[in-house]
């Protein structure tokens, strides 16, 4: 699929930082989402997981950005092998984990 360019990845990282910085209150009322396999297809996987969270304005921009990175249409309730469907975590932790991974990709130059 399409690989997000440098600037798009930076914008996504910045948005994830914005919604988590110094944040201890649960994001999205403590909603839980499926963990994802960070090794491949991370953008689609993240979208597949987060798209199941509705009515949470804090992550709407993130959802839109991820949909721009994913080559196929993702709908709520859709599952692929990219989701680790035996583990659910809070949205806040999911976003922090995703952020850490994207920062690694950025440092490695794998945009």
């Amino acid at each position: 699929g399409p690989v997000p360019p440098y600037t798009a990845l930076k914008e996504l990282i910045e948005e994830l930082v914005n919604i988590t910085q110094n944040q201890k209150a649960p994001l999205c009322n403590g909603s839980m989402v499926w963990s994802i396999n960070m090794t491949a297809g991370v953008y689609c996987a993240a979208l597949e997981s987060l798209i199941n969270v509705s009515g949470c304005s804090a992550i709407e921009k993130t959802q839109r950005m991820l949909s721009g990175f994913c080559p196929h249409k993702v709908s709520a309730g859709q599952f692929s092998s990219l989701l680790v469907r035996d583990t659910k975590i809070e949205v806040a932790q999911f976003v922090k984990d995703l952020l850490r991974h994207l920062r690694k990709l950025f440092h490695q130059g794998t945009f």
């Epitope: 930082v17 110094n22 944040q23 922090k96 440092h107």
Partner: antibody, heavy 126, light 109 residues
Framework: EVQLVESGGGLVKPGGSLRLSCAAS????????MSWVRQAPGKGLEWVGR??????????NYAAPVKGRFTISRDDSKNTLYLQMNSLKTEDTAVYYC?????????????????WGQGTTVTVSS | SYELTQPPSVSVSPGQTARITCSGD??????AYWYQQKSGQAPVLVIY???KRPSGIPERFSGSSSGTMATLTISGAQVEDEADYYC???????????FGGGTKLTVLG
């Protein structure tokens, strides 16, 4: 050794300018969010502003009393943080510290890492 | 502008428990950080993210938070703990830092 060393303080007249520098060593400076904090004589700590790491947008934020007069920048190739102070006022007289920003510690992978410089004194007086 | 409120001073005898409070409207959703500053020295972080202790900080230092109040507790205060203590956090946006006015801890020798 992990350390921060400030320089550039001194005596300046009201309305004047000064640029402070903060040289970092012993850690990956480019990953760190950095802050400037000041302390007027006999007073408490006052947050001046912060700059995020470049990867996190390089965004700057400032406290209301200095916004529009002070500018924070960084040069990751030199491991150096700067504070450009313009239109200085007598109330800007203080010891200025540079420090790693704890709010950004998670993103820099420096969870709980705390580094402060020894401070540099700025005196604004006619 | 956003403010954090601390008591100006707290006094305890050696071995007693010292509690220093910090109140702010955004503290239910934003973490608090605590710094110790001894005379003529740079501040030192003693608690981050409400209750986590950096390596090298003695176990007698602990932190907690409930609602709009964060608390630094020093269990069995020692004479060397005498210092100014500052709470630090951010406004609700997370973008702007703020320090409390500071609390002078006196450990009566």
């Amino acid at each position: 050794e992990v350390q921060l060393v400030e320089s550039g303080g001194g005596l300046v007249k009201p309305g004047g300018s000064l640029r402070l520098s903060c040289a970092a060593s012993g850690f990956t400076f480019s990953n760190a969010w950095m802050s400037w904090v000041r302390q007027a004589p006999g007073k408490g700590l006052e947050w001046v502003g912060r700059i995020r790491s470049e990867i996190d947008g390089g965004t700057t934020n400032y406290a209301a009393p200095v916004k529009g007069r002070f500018t924070i920048s960084r040069d990751d190739s030199k491991n150096t943080l700067y504070l450009q102070m313009n239109s200085l006022k007598t109330e800007d007289t203080a010891v200025y510290y540079c420090a790693t920003d704890q709010v950004g510690a998670y993103y820099g992978d420096y969870y709980g890492m705390d580094v402060w410089g020894q401070g540099t004194t700025v005196t604004v007086s006619s | 502008s956003y403010e954090l409120t601390q008591p100006p001073s707290v006094s305890v005898s050696p071995g007693q428990t010292a509690r220093i409070t910090c109140s702010g409207d955004a503290l239910p959703e934003k973490y608090a950080y605590w710094y110790q500053q001894k005379s003529g020295q740079a501040p030192v972080l003693v608690i981050y993210e409400d209750s986590k202790r950096p390596s090298g900080i003695p176990e007698r230092f602990s932190g907690s938070s409930s609602g709009t109040m964060a608390t630094l507790t020093i269990s069995g205060a020692q004479v060397e703990d005498e210092a100014d203590y500052y709470c630090h956090s951010t406004d609700s946006s997370g973008n702007h830092g703020v320090f409390g006015g500071g609390t002078k801890l006196t450990v009566l020798g």
